[in-house]
Interface confidence: low
């Protein structure tokens, strides 16, 4: 909101460059074919290319990836009985990242 | 996907926390009457709650906040030319996260 | 400082009845599974029973299903097991233990146990 | 149900040296491993979980490894109040199962 500015510090950019973001371990990644099951642990941490770049029609973007199998335990529910099963989910974590010119379609004329 | 568990590390649960995340400082929070004008820097980093709880029946939430003012350059186009000006931006911090029980109306019977 | 304080364990005839009480202090006991481990004397460690956070889901050791039942009272901090049909054989110190999330199935804190004797 | 059987079941070893105990699975399990330790006439003490990683306030000292269906605990240099009786404990099913124990004991 627009105010004083009194004890307002400049506001700083948010650069392009990777953080810790949290993905949800969704159960179709694990089985689509059955749903009484849960899964463990329900989210994970990822390193994700975010912020801003210096205008707009550039875009932060990853330009290394990585893929990062981790063990998860999938938990089916057997007679109310819980059975723990361990499945493979791939992670992809970004490793660098760049502000990449947006190519936009031109309209056609 | 399921697949080879070979050099798979146990996934570990992003537990509930403040994580760095990037906002996007849209240019109705400075001036929703006129359109004529860009925001820099546009996005900012802030601190927010993320991550999983130990069941489904709880939710990381915030359990203190702190309103961070900053400011900002809001540069408007007048005859093809840049003029800056000053504005604030309150964002809002997440200081601590808790796992909070997540109140469910019960159907009426 | 986690806290758990068994009672109401001491001797009982076979066929008989004990309630075990256990008091939870010093965590927020709602938001944890919570078990029963006993241990024959000069024996090892037999896992009894497992209760969810919010008590919905139970689970039992094959010996002891449908004599026992594990309940708990999260108003009150307390986990409960109720034994039936006591026999010989369930003779032991019982613990009650923190067992995590839901699905940790493991024992983090104990409290100090309370002994159940079964004898004529 | 999963069948632990920890050796051996009892051993002899002077402050300083160096003990492993193992602890094998009758099926895999993974890494739903948990260690715990017991001294006489006290609860049982969990000192490491998930097959290798050290619960809070449990030293160093300690260690465990392994993947599958065989795993070790490892106490790096035994210090007179390691010893007592360690248990193996598997997470990854119901009925959950402890290994038979291995007492450790001065030398």
């Known amino acids: 909101s627009l105010g004083s500015l009194a004890a307002a510090e400049p506001a700083v950019i948010a650069e392009c460059k990777t953080r810790t973001e949290v993905f949800q371990i969704s159960r179709n990644l694990i089985d689509r074919t059955n749903a009484n099951f849960l899964v463990w642990p329900p989210c994970v941490e990822v390193q994700r290319c975010s912020g801003c770049c210096n205008n707009r029609n550039v875009q932060c973007r990853a330009s290394q990836v990585q893929m990062r199998p981790v063990q998860v335990r999938k938990i089916e529910i057997v007679r109310k009985k819980p059975v723990f099963k361990k499945a493979t989910v791939t992670l992809e974590d970004h490793l660098a990242c760049k502000c990449e010119t947006v190519v936009t379609p031109r309209p056609v004329t | 996907s399921l697949g080879s568990l070979a050099a798979a590390e146990p996934a570990v649960i992003a537990e509930c926390k403040t994580r760095t995340e990037v906002f996007q400082i849209s240019r109705n929070l400075i001036d929703r009457t006129n359109a004529n004008f860009l925001v820099w820097p546009p996005c900012v980093e802030v601190q927010r709650c993320s991550g999983c709880c130990n069941n489904r029946n709880v939710q990381c939430r915030a359990s203190q906040v702190q309103m961070r003012p900053v400011q900002v350059r809001k540069i408007e186009i007048v005859r093809k030319k840049p003029v800056f000006k000053k504005a604030t931006v309150t964002l809002e911090d997440h200081l601590a996260c808790k796992c909070e029980t997540v109140v469910t109306p019960r159907p009426v019977t | 400082e986690v806290q758990l304080v068994e009672s109401g364990g001491g001797l009982v005839q076979p066929g008989g009845s004990l309630r075990l009480s256990c008091a939870a202090s010093?965590?927020?006991?709602?938001?944890?599974?919570m078990s029963w481990v006993r241990q024959a004397p000069e024996k090892g460690l037999e896992w009894v029973s497992t209760i969810s956070d919010g008590g919905g889901l139970t689970y039992y050791a094959d010996s002891v299903k449908g004599r026992f039942t594990i309940s708990r009272d999260n108003a009150k901090n307390s986990l409960y097991l109720q034994m039936n049909s006591l026999r010989a054989e369930d003779t032991a110190v019982y613990y009650c233990?923190?067992?995590?999330?839901?699905?940790?199935?493991?024992?983090?804190?104990w409290g100090q146990g309370t002994l159940v004797t079964v004898s004529s | 149900d999963i069948q632990m059987t920890q050796s051996p079941s009892s051993l002899s070893a002077s402050v300083g040296d160096r003990v492993t105990i193992t602890c094998r699975a009758s099926q895999s399990i993974s890494s739903y491993l948990n260690w715990y330790q017991q001294k006489p006439g006290k609860a049982p003490k969990l000192l490491i979980y998930?097959?290798?990683s050290l619960q809070s306030g449990v030293p160093s000292r300690f260690s465990g490894s392994g993947s599958g269906t065989d795993f070790t605990l490892t106490i790096s240099s035994l210090q007179p109040e390691d010893f007592a009786t360690y248990y193996c404990?598997?997470?990854?099913?119901?009925?959950?199962?402890f290994g038979g124990g291995t007492k450790v004991e001065i030398k």
């Open positions: 404990q598997q997470s990854y099913s119901t009925p959950l199962t």
């Open positions: 233990a923190e067992s995590g999330g839901y699905t940790d199935w493991l024992f983090g804190y």
């Open positions: 998930a097959a290798s």
């Open positions: 010093g965590f927020t006991f709602s938001s944890y599974w």
